[in-house]
């Protein structure tokens, strides 16, 4: 037989299918111009000393073979012997070892049998009522199709499906969405209406997301805050990364979770933007104030269920740094200023009350003043800390305002509202004899102690009513006691006791009259 | 004004050293976090070195350990960089930042004040 034509003779090799796993498979013949064919096959299995034998029967039942040796296509012309209009049958057999293998057969009208592509480019992917959507453009010249896919998951093998027909410039498929796992997809194509025609290869793989982005697990943890008024944010525990079916492992795209980090500052609500979005990875530096923290997880198909932790405030106080004076008109509030150009922003609230209940102040950018102070003042009108009572207040500071991450802590500290030198003034101010010549004084603490760091000392003033002398004695803000000696008996005294603040003198008490009596010896 | 202004770049043969300045003016340094980054033609700016505003803490780009010190200097409102054992891999022009990151993004993070860079070249 010449090797161009198909010989009509048995084949060299015993006619017996050993029927093993490995042989040749997925066979495709097509028409590849006017009067040339070709057929082509895989083989599965060592591959050295194989020789591939391609068998075609006609209808009239005579049957006739090419000899393909090592190779895994074949051309021939429509002179080859093979009959082009009429239908026949193929399969390839292959020589190997002493046995034959066989693939599965083919029945075809070769001249009707277009060589069919797969999707190729780019393959949409949205999800529609609960199910996956796949669309692509129509090969070109290839309009009228029959479509399958096949998908697996990382713990399942190849599943077929049918797209059913196809016929237009753009094709789709309706495939299972799976909720909690990634899976692979491909898509083959054949003519629509040709009998026996050969599937097109599988197209490449498109990787695709569950329907539910998996819950981010992530730990965070929050570094103590600087002298810059900052604290870093960092991860403690990265996401755990989906697990993907085999072809999408390496670059899978489409499978891809991003984890985006929300940020909402609670403190200071008073400021025009509260809430950023970042990728999570980038770590922001934070300040002092509250703050929730979101973890959103989110595919193609959107946004997932988030994790959300609250950083509460560092309240961590600095007694010192805030100079407040108190004037007829109203108070102002002086502190070292950070830079030129900065706003700050000024929250109060009452302490042991919701943090819900805080009230703030934004100023407008404020240079330093010739001390190097930034001052907030506000008048008693305004209502701004003017109950008697005691104060945590906090000034944030940015440079850039509109920018969340931006906002540093200057301080934090205690502050007594309203006329705190009237309102701290002690009261049940009371004297005991304490010997012949001393007596001890006890009064109730103040309100101001209720307020950290505002109480400075208690001062007690002794007035000696014959001499009109006064003395005066400091006793720590933590004592509500002092002894008074060197006292003389029958002699009228009084005695006041005023709480003051670093920034103010408080009020003396109502005078107490006492006297140390004569002592009368028997 | 507020402003960063970075000095002491310059041409260096391979093995030599540079010192370089961080000026800032119109804020007070010691409340801010600093740092180094660099950009070399055609690739992305990286971290190069940050201290802390606090503790003083440093954290260094592993290319540059044990060969760059930063530190820096409240009172004269300056923070510097001392690069000994340049590599011609060193090209690059400097920049000054705050707050520091270790991982430079200009799209992840925001910064406070930056410097418009001085340029640091390696070569024989």
């Known amino acids: 037989c010449r090797t161009s034509e198909c010989c009509f003779q048995d084949p060299p090799y015993p006619d017996a299918d050993s029927g093993s796993a490995s042989g040749p498979r997925d066979l495709r013949c097509y028409r590849i111009s006017s009067d040339r064919y070709e057929c082509s096959w895989q083989y599965e299995g060592p591959t050295a000393g194989v020789s591939h034998f391609l068998r075609c029967c006609l209808s009239s039942g005579r049957c006739c073979y090419f000899a393909a040796g090592s190779a895994t296509r074949l051309q021939f012309s429509d002179q080859a012997g093979v009959s082009v209009l009429y239908t026949v049958t193929l399969w390839v057999e292959s020589w190997a070892r002493n046995q034959t293998e066989k693939s599965p057969e083919v029945t075809l009208q070769l001249y009707n049998s277009v060589k069919y592509e797969p999707p190729l480019g780019d393959i949409k992917v949205s999800k529609l009522a609960g199910q996956l959507r796949m669309e692509w453009e129509t090969p070109d010249n290839q309009v009228g199709a029959e479509v399958q896919f096949r998908h697996r998951t990382p713990s399942s093998p190849w599943k077929l499906g049918d797209c059913g027909p196809q016929d237009d410039d753009t094709e789709s498929c309706l495939c299972p969405l799976e909720m909690n796992v990634a899976q692979e997809f491909q898509l083959r194509r054949r003519q629509l209406g040709s009998q026996g025609s050969s599937w097109s290869k599988w197209s490449s793989p498109v990787c695709v997301p569950p329907e539910n982005p998996p819950q981010p697990q992530v730990r965070f943890s929050v570094e103590q805050l600087g002298q810059d008024g900052r604290r870093r944010l960092t991860l403690k525990e990265q996401p755990t990364q989906l697990e993907l079916p085999e072809g999408c492992q390496g670059l899978a795209p489409g499978t891809e979770v991003t984890y985006r980090l929300q940020l909402h500052m609670l403190s200071c609500p008073c400021k025009a933007k509260a809430t950023r979005t970042l990728h999570l990875g980038k770590m922001p530096y934070l300040s002092g104030a509250a703050y929730n923290v979101a973890v959103i997880s989110s595919n193609q198909f959107g946004p997932g269920l988030n994790q959300t932790w609250h950083i509460p405030a560092d309240t961590h106080t600095e007694p010192v740094a805030l100079n407040i004076s108190v004037g007829t008109n109203g108070t102002t509030m002086y502190w070292p200023a950070r830079a030129q150009s900065m706003t700050y922003c000024i929250e109060w609230q009452p302490v042991g009350q919701d943090g819900g209940l805080a009230t703030c102040s934004l100023t407008a950018p404020q240079d330093p003043d010739p001390a190097g102070m930034a001052t907030y003042s506000w008048s008693r009108e305004s209502g701004a800390m003017g109950q008697e009572k005691c104060y945590y207040i906090t000034i944030f500071a940015s440079a850039h305002p509109e920018k969340l991450t931006l906002w540093s802590t200057v301080l934090s500290t205690y502050h007594f509202g309203g006329n705190a030198s009237a309102a701290g003034t002690p009261h049940h101010v009371s004297v005991k004899n304490h010997s012949l010549d001393s007596v001890s004084v006890d009064w109730a603490p103040s309100l101001l102690s209720t307020c950290p760091g505002v109480l400075k000392e208690y001062v007690v003033r002794c007035r000696d009513e014959d001499s009109k002398q006064v003395s005066e004695h400091p006793v720590q803000p933590t004592e509500t006691q002092v002894t008074l000696s060197g006292l003389r008996a029958g002699v009228a005294y009084t005695v006041q006791v005023r709480a003051d603040t670093a920034w103010l003198r408080g009020v003396w008490s109502q005078p107490q009259r006492f006297s140390i009596e004569v002592q009368v010896s028997d | 004004e507020v402003q960063l202004v970075e000095s002491g770049g310059g041409l260096v043969q391979p093995g030599g050293s540079l010192r370089l300045s961080c000026a800032a003016s119109g804020f007070t340094l010691d409340y801010y976090a600093i740092g180094w980054f660099r950009q070399a033609p055609g690739k992305e700016r990286e971290g190069v070195s940050c201290i802390s505003s606090s503790d003083r803490s440093t954290w260094y780009a592993d290319s540059v350990k044990g060969r760059f010190t930063i530190s820096r200097d409240n009172a004269k409102n300056t923070v510097y960089l001392q690069m000994h054992s340049l590599k011609p891999e060193d090209t690059a022009v400097y920049y000054c930042?705050?707050?520091?990151?270790?991982?430079?993004?200009?799209?992840?993070?925001?910064?406070?004040?930056w410097g418009q860079g001085t340029q640091v070249t390696v070569s024989s």
């Open positions: 930042a705050t707050p520091c990151y270790s991982d430079y993004d200009p799209e992840g993070y925001e910064y406070d004040y």
